[in-house]
């Protein structure tokens, strides 16, 4: 806590300006009125203050405003943000985009800090759902932000949102998160023809079923390996040969490579021998001619 | 990549004016996110900061420095100076220029000159 | 003004010997602790800045922690190229200030 003590003659701040940069820690406390600092927030981030004078005005919007700040000044904080914690972010109730992007600016370039996931989480459950410019805006700054989200979050995004979302944007996604925003993406596209439909979806297809993959293969898309390798493995087993090289057109001889790999190893040990051999790749491991094949989860679901 | 290299003379006589000056290459003074800062290191002693310009010309002298320091910006030669009038044995050192971050305020020094040793004696 | 104390003011050690120097700041800085590197007739270097972040194309063997008033920067397997002199910085408050600097020399 900072001692009370009274202002010096004179040094009373009629404004936020330049001269207050050589005020002492007691002196910024003593004779700058909080009411004042919050009514010209603008002006701070254009003066050089040190962080220890940073602390005293964030302090004396903190006496001023024990409740949280009102937006007004929250618009303005500028790198004063940087100095709050997630438990100041909590008071706050945040709704305009334009405030929530001058905050996110503030610290561009960096890690998403707990100040921030605060801000973001404070400014999505204010909205109720994650709408389309706020996906913009959320991704613009953290293109790994939805991933970061749980699949009960993702739950929330509507479906048109999913038209901000690039491919790097998915990148760490896991399959659980990709479960969510398949079903999604599919909605948002539907409208779209065959090979425009396949560039947006294509990101997505880590959470597609076996039936989407087997439409899909009937499409000539040429799937590319890396996606390919990124699909549910129980999603790709019950795939045929056929299927398989379809889908990936021109792309199936990168089956080779990557043979002892999940899905393609897991996808080998379930087909004849004698279809994977008419692919001419050399793949190994399927089942032996003359061997049957028992689908035991199918006998099961009859019992 | 940003260079600064200090100039001015190596020797000053005790009551004469220093003038010291910071050239920065391969970046603009008068962007933002920067402040432009003198330090000074006492022959085997300590560094000591003696103060900053900022590129909207707002400056800081260090006050616990006895002598009166003036810093100026130029920003059509890209440069900034330090002048100090009536120097005396004491403002003997190795004088650097460094560009600061500006982090939310001025933080670290990011990049420095190499120094240039002024000497006062008659 | 706050005063940085850092020692020890030299020590000596060999190629590959960890190298522990600290830092004690006169009052609570937070994490607004900076390390530098001093070598003669050489322009100084930024090693460290917000008292753990390596500055872009340091070497890993430099680490730094700490926060409030104890602070330490950690060579992990010192090189022929680490021997010169370090500083911390405290850029918290004006006037800025640093400590009086460890001079790492060869055993």
């Known amino acids: 806590e900072v001692e009370k003590t009274a202002c010096p003659s004179g040094k009373k701040a009629r404004e936020i300006d330049e001269s207050l940069i050589f005020y002492k820690k007691w002196e910024l406390e003593a004779c700058v009125d909080a009411a004042l600092l919050a009514t010209q927030m603008d002006r701070v981030n254009a003066i050089p203050f040190t962080y220890e004078q940073l602390d005293v005005l964030k302090h004396k919007l903190d006496e001023l405003y024990p409740q949280g700040y009102p937006e007004s000044v929250i618009q303005h904080l500028g790198y004063l943000f940087l100095k709050m914690s997630p438990e100041d972010i909590r008071k706050w109730n945040v709704t305009s985009l334009e405030t929530l992007k001058a905050l996110l600016e503030v610290n561009k370039g960096h890690e998403m800090s707990p100040q921030v996931a605060t801000l973001i989480d404070r400014f999505v459950k204010g909205r109720g759902q994650l709408d389309k410019d706020t996906l913009d805006t959320l991704t613009a700054f953290y293109p790994g932000y939805l991933c970061s989200l749980s699949p009960e979050e993702l739950s929330s995004v509507p479906p048109s949102s999913i038209w901000a979302v690039r491919p790097q944007d998915l990148d760490t996604c896991d399959p659980r998160q990709l479960d969510v925003l398949y079903p999604k993406a599919r909605l948002a596209f539907q409208n779209m023809n065959g090979s425009e439909y396949f560039v947006k979806i294509q990101s997505f297809l880590g959470g597609a079923p076996t039936e989407d993959l087997k439409a899909l293969s009937q499409q000539n898309v040429s799937m590319d390996l890396a996606t390919f390798m990124k699909l549910r493995t129980d999603a790709v087993l019950p795939l045929t040969v056929a299927e398989v090289q379809k889908l990936l057109g021109p792309h199936v001889e990168g089956l080779k490579a990557e043979e002892r790999h999940r899905p393609v190893r897991d996808w080998i040990l379930r087909q004849r021998q004698d279809d994977l051999d008419t692919l001419g790749l050399g793949l190994q491991g399927g089942i032996p001619n003359g061997y049957l094949v028992l689908d035991l989860s199918m006998q099961e679901a009859l019992s | 990549q940003v260079q600064l290299q200090e100039s001015g003379p190596g020797l000053v006589k005790p009551s004469q004016t220093l003038s010291l000056t910071c050239t920065v290459s391969?970046?603009?003074?008068?962007?933002?996110?920067?402040?432009w800062n003198w330090i000074r290191q006492h022959p085997g002693q300590c560094l000591e900061w003696i103060g900053y310009?900022?590129?909207?010309?707002?400056?800081y002298s260090n006050p616990s420095l006895k002598s009166l320091f003036t810093i100026s910006l130029d920003t059509s030669k890209n440069q900034f100076s330090l002048k100090l009038s009536s120097v005396t044995a004491a403002d003997t050192a190795v004088y650097y220029c460094?560009?600061?971050?500006?982090?939310?305020?001025?933080?670290?020094?990011?990049?420095w000159g190499q120094g240039t040793m002024v000497t006062v004696s008659s | 003004e706050i005063q940085m104390t850092q020692s020890p003011s030299s020590l000596s050690a060999s190629v590959g010997d960890r190298v522990t120097i600290t830092c004690q700041a006169s009052q609570d800085i937070s994490n607004y602790l900076n390390w530098y590197q001093l070598k003669p007739g050489k322009a100084p270097k930024l090693l460290i800045q917000?008292?753990?972040s390596l500055q872009g194309g340091v070497p890993s063997r430099f680490s730094g922690s700490g926060s409030g008033t104890d602070f330490t920067l950690t060579i992990s397997s010192l090189q022929p190229e680490d021997f010169a002199t370090y500083y911390c910085?405290?850029?918290?408050?004006?006037?800025?200030?640093f400590g009086c600097g460890t001079k790492v020399e060869i055993k």
């Open positions: 391969g970046g603009s003074i008068s962007s933002g996110g920067y402040y």
């Open positions: 917000a008292a753990s």
């Open positions: 910085q405290q850029s918290y408050s004006t006037p800025f200030t």
């Open positions: 310009i900022f590129y909207s010309g707002i400056t």
């Open positions: 460094a560009r600061g971050l500006v982090r939310g305020a001025p933080d670290a020094f990011d990049i």
